[in-house]
């Protein structure tokens, strides 16, 4: 059976939108009016993984691009990156673990925890125009809460 996917945009809890910053990086910044068209549209795929009451495993691809958010070790630190894939083989139900995030929705907080690196979350900085990154559980002022906006296919 084909993997179930939906198209959406994400904004952090400070209402910063996510946009491309070069070919393999996302950044978060406030957008208004026509600039909103810059924000990336994700294709969120519901994939195989450990499901629990609060966690749903998903993969986050960029719509109509063969790029997926993935989590890898760089210099011994869990790191978020955009990774190119073969569009003939992706998305798929059994995604490699580096592509899988636990979507956690509690009391209107939406978080994305790396399945590969538990306790590491997709994060944005308080500051404007900074890269989206993978942050630890004690991230201080870093933002890990998002809202999701559905986009029609």
């Amino acid at each position: 059976a084909p993997v179930r996917s939906l198209n959406c945009t994400l904004r952090d809890s400070q209402q910063k939108s996510l946009v491309m910053s070069g070919p393999y990086e996302l950044k978060a910044l406030h957008l208004q009016g026509q600039d909103m068209e810059q924000q990336v549209v994700f294709s969120m795929s519901f994939v195989q993984g450990e499901e629990s009451n609060d966690k749903i495993p998903v993969a986050l691809g960029l719509k109509e691009k063969n790029l997926y958010l993935s989590c890898v070790l760089k210099d011994d630190k869990p790191t978020l990156q955009l990774e190119s894939v073969d569009p003939k083989n992706y998305p798929k139900k059994k995604m490699e673990k580096r592509f899988v995030f636990n979507k956690i929705e509690i009391n209107n907080k939406l978080e994305f925890e790396s399945a590969q690196f538990p306790n590491w979350y997709i994060s944005t900085s308080q500051a404007e125009n900074m890269p989206v990154f993978l942050g630890g559980t004690k991230g201080g002022q870093d933002i890990t809460d998002f809202t999701m906006q559905f986009v029609s296919s």
């Epitope: 629990s52 009391n107 538990p118 306790n119 630890g136 004690k138």
Partner: antibody, heavy 120, light 108 residues
Framework: QVQLQESGPGLVKPSETLSLTCTVS????????WSWIRQPAGKGLEWIGR???????NYRPSLKSRITMSVDTSKNQFSLKLSSVTAADTAVYYC???????????????WGRGTLVTVS | SYELTQPPSVSVSPGQTARITCSGD??????AYWYQQKSGQAPVLVIY???KRPSGIPERFSGSSSGTMATLTISGAQVEDEADYYC???????????FGGGTKLTVL
């Protein structure tokens, strides 16, 4: 402000089922997560389990097979049932509101006064 | 299973600084919370997210965390601070909740 009040029989016979109810006043039970915690006399606090209105639950592994938690939204109450009790289940039982502060961190910000249940 | 370890008791004289420690393998990743429980009463949250103080809690209560150790500090302890103190955290893997064994603080 939100207040919690536990109620139920203070004495339960061994092998029977302990049933407790927590009544939430001053707020809606539907919008939050709720936990049960117990404290045997002279001992420390022990988390029993938590649930959310949608049916999401997490139970203490050692008690999982004996626990049932449910909710009655019309009465703004939630309940705990613990089956096959023994003297080791004698404790003060507390209900508490379970708050999520993000990044996998949960805590209890509001507690009931507690009710003593003796198994004898 | 995940455990939090506290000293069973701490004693100070009034006006002295009391420090209660809590150690646990998940504390580098998860926040520590501290509850005060006076005799015959329900626990009250005195510190959350390692070092934040809820409104209504006196400034003499503070918290810190470094590595696998969290510390509750009561600067200028008063007789009314005599109570059991429990550290608490969330198990890293499965959302199960863990309390330390409790520390009896005596102020005399």
């Amino acid at each position: 402000q939100v207040q919690l009040q536990e109620s139920g029989p203070g004495l339960v016979k061994p092998s029977e089922t302990l049933s407790l109810t927590c009544t939430v006043s001053g707020g809606s039970i539907s919008s939050d997560y709720w936990s049960w915690i117990r404290q045997p006399a002279g001992k420390g606090l022990e988390w029993i389990g938590r649930f959310y209105n949608s049916g999401r639950t997490n139970y203490r592994p050692s008690l999982k097979s004996r626990i049932t938690m449910s909710v009655d939204t019309s009465k703004n109450q939630f309940s705990l049932k613990l089956s096959s009790v023994t003297a080791a289940d004698t404790a003060v039982y507390y209900c508490a509101r379970d708050m999520y502060s993000g990044r996998g961190n949960w805590y209890f910000d509001l507690w009931g006064r507690g009710t003593l249940v003796t198994v004898s | 299973s995940y455990e939090l370890t506290q000293p069973p008791s701490v004693s100070v004289s009034p006006g002295q600084t009391a420090r209660i420690t809590c150690s646990g393998d998940a504390l580098p990743k998860k926040y520590a919370y501290w509850y005060q429980q006076k005799s015959g009463q329900a626990p009250v949250l005195v510190i959350y997210e390692d070092s934040k103080r809820p409104s209504g809690i006196p400034e003499r209560f503070s918290g810190s965390s470094s590595g696998t150790m969290a510390t509750l500090t009561i600067s200028g302890a008063q007789v009314e601070d005599e109570a059991d103190y429990y550290c608490y955290s969330t198990d890293s893997s499965d959302n199960h909740r863990v309390f330390g064994g409790g520390t009896k603080l005596t102020v005399l």
